[in-house]
Interface confidence: medium
């Protein structure tokens, strides 16, 4: 015998109290598959969460995070504060870049300052947690029209610094 509930489409539930009639999901609930005996309560995006997609009778609401926060976990189950410049995201949250490294973005990792001496140049402006060093001219750069700023070195792994 076929289960009469199997005829109930998504957006409805099989109402045992009404002779297994397919009843529409009540407000603020949904069923995403057919043959359901109950409808699930819609997710509510509150506080630091904001609604990315409204709940419908056939699909749950989807949340994302308010500005200054980003999603973590499956289906944006958590919101975590964005890191600031001069910080990087670790498993223990946002942590300041250590001396000799910088991050000029709100995402990503702290990277080592450019080593000016590798290019035979001197440090014109010291680095900070938020900014790379600016390399000054080497003797060869003092000819007219030469640029005095070296572009940052390519991104590489900062290496395992803690001892």
């Amino acid at each position: 015998l076929q289960d009469p509930c199997s005829n109930c489409p998504a957006g409805t539930f099989c109402d045992n109290n009404r002779n297994q009639i397919c009843s529409p999901c009540p407000p603020n609930s949904f069923s995403s598959a057919g043959g359901q005996r109950t409808c699930d309560i819609c997710r509510q995006c509150k506080g630091v969460f904001r609604t990315r997609k409204e709940c419908s009778s056939t699909s749950n609401a989807e949340c994302d995070c308010t500005p200054g926060f980003h999603c973590l976990g499956a289906g944006c189950s958590m919101c975590e504060q964005d890191c600031k410049q001069g910080q990087e995201l670790t498993k223990k949250g946002c942590k300041d870049c250590c001396f000799g490294t910088f991050n000029d973005q709100k995402r990503g990792i702290c990277r080592p300052w450019t080593n000016c001496s590798l290019d035979g140049k001197s440090v014109l402006v010291n680095g900070t947690k938020e900014r790379d060093v600016v390399c000054g001219p080497s003797p060869a750069d003092l000819s007219p029209g030469a640029s005095s700023v070296t572009p940052p070195a390519p991104a590489r792994e900062p290496g395992h610094s803690p001892q």
Partner: antibody
Framework: EVQLVESGGGLVQPGGSLRLSCAAS?????????MCWVRQAPGKGLEWIGC????????YYASWAKGRFTISRDNSKNTVYLQMNSLRAEDTAVYYC?????????????????WGQGTLVTVSS | IQMTQSPSSLSASVGDRVTITCQSS????????LAWYQQKPGKAPKLLIY???NLASGVPSRFSGSGSGTDFTLTISSLQPEDFATYYC????????????FGTGTKVTVL
Amino acid sequence: EVQLVESGGGLVQPGGSLRLSCAASGFSFNNDYDMCWVRQAPGKGLEWIGCIDTGDGSTYYASWAKGRFTISRDNSKNTVYLQMNSLRAEDTAVYYCAREAASSSGYGMGYFDLWGQGTLVTVSS
Amino acid sequence: IQMTQSPSSLSASVGDRVTITCQSSQSVYDNNWLAWYQQKPGKAPKLLIYRASNLASGVPSRFSGSGSGTDFTLTISSLQPEDFATYYCQGTYLSSNWYWAFGTGTKVTVL
């Protein structure tokens, strides 16, 4: 030299127990990143077992490993352990110790930048 | 959490461009906590790429990574003889607790 050396592998009967060790040299544990265990059955892929936070001792396990496998550490010896109980034939594998890379500030970054050479565990009667 | 790599194996020639994909059943932490490793027979894995697109120290620039969330790609721009190996992706996740997972692996062999 920075390295990890596993030991303690060998032949064990089904239902038996074994404790593997992972000795670290060239760096010290007292930081907030993890030391982890990963295994690889013969001819198969890598399988994460679990990790221990070298700072606060928190442990994290794969769902299949909970209950039978226990990770511990001795920071004074710079050594991490994997205690394996109720061993089965399907636990036969090379067991690797791996260090989670740390950020510039010394916190875990989620990927493994240093691996041991592995130790073979064979579960057979 | 399932991490599926495709293809599971491929044959290629030196100089070929090789692309391996990794699909996760859940978004990795911060959408980019994904790493790639190379493993040769009888050896431990070696880190190639971290945070989805950052080249690890000492890794040749012919290796590159891209992707975000659940879908990631490892590309070898011009395959070299030493690149014949098995490649694994690895994701880091946070739900109620920290969790790591490896992909199913892709074996790259000589055509």
